[in-house]
Amino acid sequence: VPRWRQQWSGPGTTKRFPETVLARCVKYTEIHPEMRHVDCQSVWDAFKGAFISKHPCNITEEDYQPLMKLGTQTVPCNKILLWSRIKDLAHQFTQVQRDMFTLEDTLLGYLADDLTWCGEFNTSKINYQSCPDWRKDCSNNPVSVFWKTVSRRFAEAACDVVHVMLNGSRSKIFDKNSTFGSVEVHNLQPEKVQTLEAWVIHGGREDSRDLCQDPTIKELESIISKRNIQFSCKNIYRPDKFLQCVKNPEDSSCTSEI
């Protein structure tokens, strides 16, 4: 008789999850000389230890501390790019502007990007069938707690001018419930961060509105100002041209508004 297994509402662990994490770790350390001291087997053991044999609705930040310690990484604190609901463009940007970093350009972010994982209470099995959904099941699931933990640490490390890319095509350009809105905004350190600069990315070619005047952006400005951090906002009307001009800043067409 098969053992009863909890059915969650979300997709199960990504197939070949252990191999993916380990291979990504090896690849990351291969590409980044400053991380070549990292022992990828130990990283995987710590990652696994955070969720294996634990109830997938009862994961804490404490569970991830051994992994956080092994993945400690110094990125230039004044070169941090946060993003909300516009990951692909943010990553395209840091691939071109190599001195800037999103969370997914760090080891821990790179390991977990686009992956799902969870275990089962009291068994050493990984659950490939289903994992808890943040809304329908529980918020303290392995994936959500991981991103909350690394996002908090990433925001805490930021200094000087911090940039955030926001999706101007969404009804809530700034969403208080996003990781940026619920975690990163509240963990920027006012004694280190002088300014948060928002880049609002326009979706439509003919969209010439000033989305920096959007009510949700005003809400973000209010939250940031109350935290004694200055706020500025720029419209990126043409994201394709924006990326092209990051690649080739000397291009004559790059002097006009993007």
Epitope: E19, C25, E30, H37
Partner: antibody, heavy 116, light 107 residues
Framework: QVQLVQSGAEVKKPGSSVKVSCKAS????????ISWVRQAPGQGLEWMGG????????QYAQKFQGRVTITADESTSTAYMELSSLRSEDTAVYYC?????????WGQGTLVTVSA | EIVMTQSPATLSVSPGERATLSCRAS??????LAWYQQKPGQAPRLLIY???TRATGIPARFSGSGSGTEFTLTISSLQSEDFAVYYC?????????FGQGTKVEIK
């Protein structure tokens, strides 16, 4: 305990190709890099390139670019190194090793002799 | 590419004595340096990585130090099985490069 076992010695003619295999056992193969290092008789060690089988994208030293092909077969836990347009100076022992930049487990080596 | 230069080419030491081997990089390699031991007819064996971390199973008499461009491998008290050729290797910049080796022989 991970072990790497390489194919046997080869004698080749100049201009031909050689393909050396490296079979891994006793450990997970896919996510560790396998690198290839050669050593000419009485000489030092020379890194040729490597591959992480899981990703399948090899890295080559510039010197060997265009002449070397490194591949891996996850199903058999075997990595391969093929060197083409052989010349006499390619006579060497060819080693596979685990790791992409520091090499903690080595194969026993495969002697490739290039001679007319 | 980074050139690794080892000295001396040959080191004659009596068993029980201390041996000090040097390795110099043509530009900084941070701490991304490994040492290997190779005996005749055998594959190399990893001794030290990260300039100073001993690999699994390597006796405590082997120690590594240095960073940047100057590195040292020290064998505190040579045993008969330590007579071999020693190579340093940088893994900071592609392509990874090895020194030409130092042969440690019995005096």
């Amino acid at each position: 305990q991970v072990q790497l076992v390489q194919s046997g010695a080869e004698v080749k003619k100049p201009g031909s190709s050689v393909k050396v295999s490296c079979k891994a056992s006793g450990g997970l193969f896919s996510f560790y890099a396998i690198s290839w290092v050669r050593q000419a008789p009485g000489q030092g060690l020379e890194w040729m390139g490597g591959i992480i089988p899981f990703f399948g994208e090899p890295q080559y030293a510039q010197k060997f670019q265009g002449r070397v092909t490194i591949t891996a077969d996850e199903s058999t836990s075997t990595a391969y190194m093929e060197l083409s347009s052989l010349r006499s100076e390619d006579t060497a022992v060819y080693y596979c090793a685990r790791g992409s930049y520091r090499f903690d487990v080595w194969g026993q080596g495969t002697l490739v002799t290039v001679s007319a | 590419e980074i050139v690794m230069t080892q000295s001396p080419a040959t080191l004659s030491v009596s068993p029980g004595e201390r041996a000090t081997l040097s390795c110099r990089a043509s530009q900084s390699v941070s701490s991304n340096l490994a040492w290997y031991q190779q005996k005749p007819g055998q594959a190399p064996r990893l001794l030290i990585y990260g300039a100073s971390t001993r690999a699994t199973g390597i006796p405590a008499r082997f120690s590594g130090s240095g960073s940047g461009t100057e590195f040292t491998l020290t064998i505190s008290s040579l045993q008969s099985e330590d007579f071999a050729v020693y190579y340093c290797q940088q893994y900071n910049n592609w392509p990874w490069t090895f020194g030409q080796g130092t042969k440690v022989e019995i005096k």
